[in-house]
């Protein structure tokens, strides 16, 4: 389906509003340090050019690829060398190398100030004064901080952001209406960003075979009534969509996502009975709804898997004829029967099955060799079941904050070389698995927990890749996508680690502690806890608990004092001395 002008094609398909939004997101994800005004100017120039191509597809430069057009535009930025350093070298390259170069310079942890939320009245005034600019600023600020955010989904978040302000700025109590909505959007947005980052890592680091396997498993759980051929078609289309978005081809990605939503809604009968309410919604909402749709009910009469995958005399013949398809069918059949398993577990089972067939189908008596293959699955299934059970018990016993602290200690002991801010961020997020998953019924716990942990551990892998400090982290992150979580779970105390020298400055606190939000206080305390473990990796739980209890008491005491700063100055060194003694 070739077009004389790709830019005209996408402009017509997407419409001006979505076209402009997606180009702004694309530019903001590539040039994360550029000021908002600069990006708006570039987007307006591209949009005007697209309109000339819509009017006449034969006009000059209209036949150029989107990468060429966008790359040329990005390379006009005057301060590229000063702001981005070696990224400016990308501009000396030709397509497709230039785009690859831009992609490689995306920064998962850009040095940008945290977004500060102004007063509600200030935000409402800004919204009413210039709604379009207000919403563009939202797209820009999110996109530059999350350079792999799923672009068509970000347009959906922006639409919800707009709706929240339109409703709440009219309300009697603006803050009561708006703030919970903004909190929800922030939390959902962070989760969405992290989930998409795992998809991109899967595609970029492990190839589209890995992504397709993930998609077969997940879609087979969601759509257990669909035929394998239908699931395969959806997987192929979904892989194309995510490959495009992860590759910076945001216009193509959004267009193809809309086509996929259209196809699913036109073929509901052969996919799932749960799609109906999604399909009545407008485009952005519809695509979001389809992505989040609950699992359909399993067909009642599914036969045993053993017949086709263990007992049949054709197992090796069928495997040899089309290995990936046969494994895909196995994964489909297993996943549709097991919505209670995590996708990662299902992929481990498929991997184990593949390894068995590779070994046994070349043996003298294949059937005798693979006859017990399903028995070999048992330990693979029990491992995450036990992990979820133990950690949910610990979460219920400790509560979220102390559960996070237990994970902080656990992970700092495993990989003490990792930076303290990264350990705090990752362990806090690992700890959120409790509140997210442990309240669910048994059948939903493992898919919730393990697939969430995979997303969080991917964040650790992505940050660690930027500044590698631990061979153990590199090994767990790169050897196998499906075994990342078990790999991290299996890590023990790093005996080779040389404890960090004690630095009193790290444990010096001031009166500003008292004005921090509860969350910020927790982060301060958890930062201190990581530093303690780095200093004394072999400290016992009891020792660390004692120090943290003393710390909480010391902060509480000084925050109640009349002269807070004097209290911190006087009590701080006492706390440090007592802590050192307790950990000696």
């Amino acid at each position: 389906d070739t077009h004389k002008s790709e830019v005209a094609h996408r402009f017509k398909d997407l419409g001006e509003e979505h076209f402009k939004g997606l180009v702004l997101v694309a530019f903001s994800q590539y040039l994360q340090q550029c000021p908002f005004e600069e990006h708006v100017k570039l987007v307006n120039e591209v949009t005007e050019f697209a309109k000339t191509c819509v009017a006449d597809e034969s006009a000059e430069n209209c036949d150029k690829s989107l990468h060429t057009l966008f790359g040329d535009k990005l390379c006009t930025v005057a301060t590229l060398r000063e702001t981005y350093g070696e990224m400016a070298d990308c501009c000396a390259k030709q397509e497709p190398e230039r785009n690859e170069c831009f992609l490689q310079h995306k920064d998962d942890n850009p040095n940008l100030p945290p977004l500060v939320r102004p007063e509600v009245d200030v935000m409402c005034t800004a919204f009413h004064d210039n709604e379009a600019t207000f919403l563009k600023k939202y797209l820009y600020e999110v996109a530059r901080r999350h350079p792999y955010f799923y672009a068509p989904e970000l347009l959906f978040f922006a639409a919800r952001y707009k709706a929240a302000f339109a409703e709440c700025c009219q309300a009697a109590d603006k803050a009561a209406c708006l703030l919970p909505k903004l909190d929800e959007l922030r939390d959902e947005g962070k989760a969405s960003s992290a989930k998409q980052r795992l998809k991109c890592a899967s595609l970029q680091k492990f190839g589209d075979r890995a992504f397709k396997a993930w998609a077969v498993a997940r879609l087979s759980q969601k759509f257990p009534k669909a035929e394998f051929a239908e699931v395969s078609k959806l997987v192929t289309d979904l892989t194309k969509v995510h490959t495009e978005c992860c590759h910076g081809d945001l216009l193509e990605c959004a267009d193809d996502r809309a086509d996929l939503a259209k196809y699913m809604c036109e073929n509901q009968d052969s996919i799932s009975s749960k799609l109906k309410e999604c399909c009545d919604k407008p485009l952005l909402e519809k695509s979001h709804c389809l992505a989040e749709v609950e699992n359909d009910e399993m067909p009642a009469d599914l036969p045993s898997l053993a017949a086709d995958y263990v007992e049949s005399k054709d197992v090796c013949k069928n495997y040899a004829e089309a290995k990936d398809v046969f494994l895909g069918m196995f994964l489909y059949e297993y996943a549709r029967r097991h919505p209670d398993y995590s996708v990662m577990l299902l992929l481990r089972l498929a991997k184990a099955y593949e390894a068995t067939l590779e070994k046994c189908c070349a043996a003298a008596d294949p059937h005798e060799c693979y006859a017990k293959v399903f028995d070999e699955f048992q330990p693979l299934v029990e491992e995450p079941q036990n992990l979820v059970k133990q950690n949910c018990e610990l979460f219920e016993q400790l509560g979220e904050y102390k559960f996070q602290n237990a994970l902080l200690v656990r992970y700092t002991k495993k990989v003490p070389q990792v930076s303290t801010p990264t350990l705090v961020e990752v362990s806090r997020n690992l700890g959120k698995v409790g509140a997210k998953c442990c309240k669910l019924p048994e059948a939903k716990r493992m898919p919730c927990a393990e697939d969430y942990l995979s997303v969080v551990l991917n964040r650790l892998c992505v940050l660690h890749e930027k500044t590698p400090v631990s061979e153990k982290v590199t090994k767990c992150c790169t050897e196998s996508l499906v075994n990342r979580r078990p790999c991290f779970s299996a890590l023990e105390l790093d005996e080779a680690y040389v404890p960090k020298a004690f630095n009193a400055e790290t444990f010096t606190f001031h009166a500003d502690m008292c004005t921090l939000s509860e969350k910020e206080k927790q982060v301060k305390k958890q930062t201190a806890l990581v530093e303690l473990v780095k200093h004394k990796p072999k400290a016992t739980k009891e020792q660390l608990k004692g120090v943290m209890d003393n710390f909480a008491a010391f902060v509480e005491k000084c925050c109640k004092a009349d002269d807070k700063e004097a209290c911190f100055a006087e009590e701080g060194p006492k706390f440090v001395a007592a802590s050192q003694a307790a950990l000696a």
Epitope: E227, N318, Y319, A320, E321
Partner: nanobody, 123 residues
Framework: EVQLVESGGGEVQPGGSLRLSCAAS????????MVWVRQAPGKGLEWVST????????RYAESVKGRFTISRDNAKNTLYLQMNSLRAEDTAVYYC????????????????WGQGTLVTVKP
């Protein structure tokens, strides 16, 4: 465009030998499993042999086991079937095939086919 071109068929006496070849193009031969299937006059399709992409896994129908040998040369994009101790009941058109798409492996409508090469075994 996928193309499979068989050659090497002919007329042979019982107990004789033939070597069939199948030249493949238009798809990733080296990552595709390959199959020989035959159709005797007035009969349905009969699977003969399968070889995996890397030739580690090889399967034969009981009727040809010990007499036929399947092999492949991925550098030349060619599939072979060495047929020894031929019998009258081996008379058939021999096709090479590879899985294309669809819902089931082994249901041969979902495979790409060659045009076939005739093997006749008669005294």
């Amino acid at each position: 465009e996928v193309q499979l071109v068989e050659s090497g068929g002919g007329e042979v006496q019982p107990g004789g030998s033939l070597r069939l070849s199948c030249a493949a193009s238009g798809f990733a031969f080296s990552t595709s499993g390959m199959v020989w299937v035959r159709q005797a006059p007035g009969k349905g399709l009969e699977w003969v042999s399968t070889i995996s992409d890397d030739a580690r896994i090889i399967r034969y129908a009981e009727s040809v086991k010990g007499r036929f040998t399947i092999s492949r040369d991925n550098a030349k994009n060619t599939l072979y079937l060495q047929m020894n101790s031929l019998r009258a009941e081996d008379t058939a058109v021999y096709y090479c095939a590879t899985y294309r798409a669809g819902s089931r492996i082994g249901s041969y409508e979902d495979y790409y086919w060659g045009q076939g090469t005739l093997v006749t075994v008669k005294p």
